[in-house]
């Protein structure tokens, strides 16, 4: 679609005459017919295919055309056409004498043609007028003309519609082939695709808008590179959505079990070795001088009661030393100067010779202990609770108050949870300080495994074109990560089929 | 070929919530060259353009309706949703979904068989 | 907002030309589709962008778009052309539909 501008600038007939050489009268009132068509190499009367037009009086004899454009629209002269513009064309323009006001072709008497000119050729689409001159025996005729496209209409012949737009079916102009220019930010055939932050991942990100960059299920961070662990993982990481691998000292499905409790809590203190032992669970080497579960009491040298036979310790700067009673003496008295004679064995004790009567060893009675049998029995002092259990001496006897998650006389046991097979279905049961916790087989969850769940949501494999599946174990469903060329909510159509239409 | 099935209730009280979901068959909801819009026709009346969503979730709506209406697009089911919120009798009508084409500049080329909803106490 | 006016109704003989008009504020500018629709049914897509067919449409069916009016072309026309025509255009990012023309074939 475009139009034939016709521009009109100067007739020239002196002497006012018609074709005929009979001179008008008074003078000859001068309009334009022009008649537009297909290209004859000779050309011809006949249908005007591609338009005519007529003009109204222009001018008296010799006149010049004044640009009339604004005032009307009557010069250029516009012969619209509404097809392909074939790049060739014949051109009629005839000059007509108006005796009236009637200027409809039945009306004139046929000897008022005053000139008569033909023209045919090339002529491309374009803004640049052609400026041509006619001239027969008695008038001259001087005038442009040019072919332009309509609006919205672009390329060599005026054939590719294009209408700038922006809104979400294109954002783009026209460039002067029709072709799309799209505005900053929007890519795609039509423009209509938003060109996304710069680095937002392609698979796992999208946009809206340009330079937005928003992540699909089960990844996230500002270029959707950063995969989201499963829901509830605290110690671990993932390397695709919906994981949770443990980091180094943790353990259990959400990484929240401590298997190095010595390295993240350090407690054993003054200086103790510290040894894991199972989860949440360790045990201290105290140095010498310190005692406690965590090595936390500093010891008294005197507190074991290495002196014997009743001799006093006393604590010095660099260990100690041992007072003896009459009768016995070394490091820690435990050399005796007495014999059974002396009476030596207390509180019921019975004395035993030995060595020919050079030396003594008491037997005590029960409740009894030390070389002379003169201390009463703390069963205590051996530390025989274990696992910080407290020691507490009860008479003759002695008990164990253990710590909680401990049972037994030594508090040597751990009590389990597990033992009444708490977890359903076959879930594994495993011990925690606070409780227990279950791990369910696939098909079951809840606390103890009692609720039954749909299965693995991906292992049916219901992801095409080599997508890769991710189970989104919170709501049991499946997300499909389409490669590039692909989409569908299992990657199963390819992008960008032809459209089909109904009829 | 490409189908589109509306279903939803066909009676709704005033003041209440209109709920309209649009299933595609034989096409992928996810393509980047369709946008899947509503219009509504009042019995007797013209059509009126509601409003499109892209597979992506960008929505666009008629500023007519925009403050009660929610288009939502499920790409796992090949659906989307239509809301419209504190409906009156005038929001009776024959509701259609259809596909607008990108290539088509927009012309819509495929149209659900359209549900009549009728508000009414 | 923007508006699409046509006219109510149109009348044609058999075998005769009808035109639609559609007529919008610089509706030049902007693509154009029409749709067609007998009683009961869905609406069809006759024309979109200006003047293009779908396949299916049938040649006497045709559009233009200039300055503020489309006009849709209905060439030879048949009883089966009975029914209502709506112009449709895009204002921004709303889909703007006419107020619809019932054509009757006498």
């Known amino acids: 679609s475009g139009v034939f501008q016709l521009q009109l600038q100067e007739f020239i007939n002196e002497r006012g005459v018609l074709a005929s050489g009979r001179p008008c009268e008074p003078g000859c009132r001068t309009f334009f017919r022009v008649c537009l068509k297909h290209f004859q190499a000779v050309v011809s009367p006949g249908p005007c295919t591609f338009g005519t037009v007529s003009t109204p009086v222009l001018g008296t004899n010799s006149f010049a055309v004044r640009d009339d454009s604004s005032g009307g629209g009557r010069n250029p002269l516009q012969l619209p056409f509404n097809f392909t513009w074939p790049g060739t064309f014949s051109l009629i323009i005839e000059a007509w004498h108006a005796p009236g006001d009637d200027l409809r072709p039945e009306a004139l008497p046929p000897d008022a043609l005053i000139s008569k000119i033909a023209i045919q050729g090339s002529l491309a689409v374009g803004q640049n007028w052609l400026l041509d001159e006619q001239t027969s025996t008695l008038t001259r005729l001087r005038y442009s003309y040019r072919v332009i496209c309509s609006d919205n209409y672009y390329g060599d012949n005026c054939s590719r519609l294009c209408k700038k737009r922006n809104d979400h079916f294109g954002h783009y102009v026209c460039q002067p082939d029709g072709n799309l220019s799209c505005l900053p930010g929007w890519t795609g055939e039509y423009c209509q695709q938003p060109i996304c932050l710069s680095g937002c991942h392609e698979q796992n990100g999208y946009c809206s808008k340009p330079a937005e960059c928003l992540c699909r299920p089960g990844w996230q961070g500002r270029l959707c590179n950063e995969c989201i662990p499963h829901n509830g993982c605290r110690h671990g990481t993932c390397s695709t959505p919906w994981q949770c691998t443990c980091d180094e000292g943790w353990g259990g499905l959400f990484c929240d079990q401590d298997l190095n409790y010595c390295t993240h809590h350090s407690p054993c203190k003054n200086g103790a070795t510290c040894s894991n032992s199972g989860q949440r669970s360790y045990t201290c080497t105290c140095r010498p001088g310190y005692t406690g579960v965590d090595c936390e009491l500093e010891l008294s040298e005197c507190d074991s009661n290495p002196c014997r036979n009743g001799g006093s310790c006393k604590d010095q700067e660099d260990g100690y030393h041992c007072l003896c009673p009459p009768g016995y003496y070394g490091l820690h008295c435990e050399h005796s100067t007495l014999s059974c004679a002396d009476s030596p064995c207390f509180n019921g004790g019975s004395c035993r010779e030995r060595n020919q009567g050079a030396n003594y060893a008491c037997e005590c009675p029960p409740n009894f202990t030390g070389s002379n049998c003169e201390k009463k029995v703390d069963r205590c002092t051996s530390n025989p609770c274990a696992n910080g259990g407290q020691c507490l001496n009860r008479g003759p006897s002695r008990m164990c108050r253990c710590r909680p998650g401990f049972t037994g006389t030594y508090c040597e046991l751990h009590v389990s949870d597990c033992a009444r097979n708490p977890c359903a279905h076959g879930g594994t049961c495993h011990d925690l300080e606070n409780g227990l916790m279950c791990t369910c087989p696939a098909g079951f969850s809840g606390r103890r495994c009692e609720v039954r769940t749909s299965i693995d949501a991906c292992a049916s494999s219901p992801c095409f074109n080599r997508a890769t599946c991710y189970t989104d174990l919170s709501t049991d469903t499946f997300v499909c990560n389409c490669p590039y060329g692909f989409v569908g909510s299992r990657c199963e159509f390819p992008v960008g089929l032809p459209p089909s239409f109904p009829w | 070929e490409v189908q589109l099935q509306e279903s939803g209730p066909g009676l709704v009280k005033p003041s209440e919530t209109l709920s309209l979901t649009c299933t595609v068959s034989?096409?992928?909801?996810?393509?980047?060259?369709?946008?899947w819009g509503w219009i509504r026709q009042p019995p007797g009346k013209g059509l009126e353009w509601i409003g499109d969503?892209?597979?992506?979730?960008?929505?666009y709506y008629n500023p007519s309706l925009k403050s009660r209406v929610t288009i939502s697009v499920d790409t796992s089911k090949n659906q989307f949703s239509l809301k419209l919120s504190s409906v009156t009798a005038a929001d009776t009508a024959v509701y259609y979904c259809?596909?607008?084409?990108?290539?088509?500049?927009?012309?819509?080329?495929?149209w659900g068989q359209g549900t009549l909803v009728t508000v009414s106490s | 907002s923007y508006e699409l006016t046509q006219p109510p109704s149109v009348s044609v003989s058999p075998g005769q030309t009808a035109s639609i008009t559609c007529s919008g504020q610089?509706?030049?500018?902007?693509?154009v589709s029409w749709y067609q629709q007998k009683p009961g049914q869905s609406p069809v897509l006759v024309i979109y962008?200006?003047?293009k067919r779908p396949s299916g449409i049938p040649e006497r069916f045709s559009g233009s778009n200039s300055g503020d009016t489309a006009t849709l072309t209905i060439s030879g026309t048949q009883p089966m052309d009975e029914a209502d025509y709506y112009c449709q255009a895009w204002d921004r990012d709303v889909g703007v539909f006419g107020s619809g023309t019932k054509v009757t074939v006498l």
């Open positions: 962008e200006d003047s």
């Open positions: 034989g096409g992928s909801i996810s393509s980047s060259s369709y946008y």
């Open positions: 610089r509706l030049g500018d902007k693509y």
């Open positions: 969503i892209y597979y992506t979730g960008s929505t």
């Open positions: 259809a596909r607008e084409d990108v290539i088509l500049r927009g012309g819509s080329d495929y």
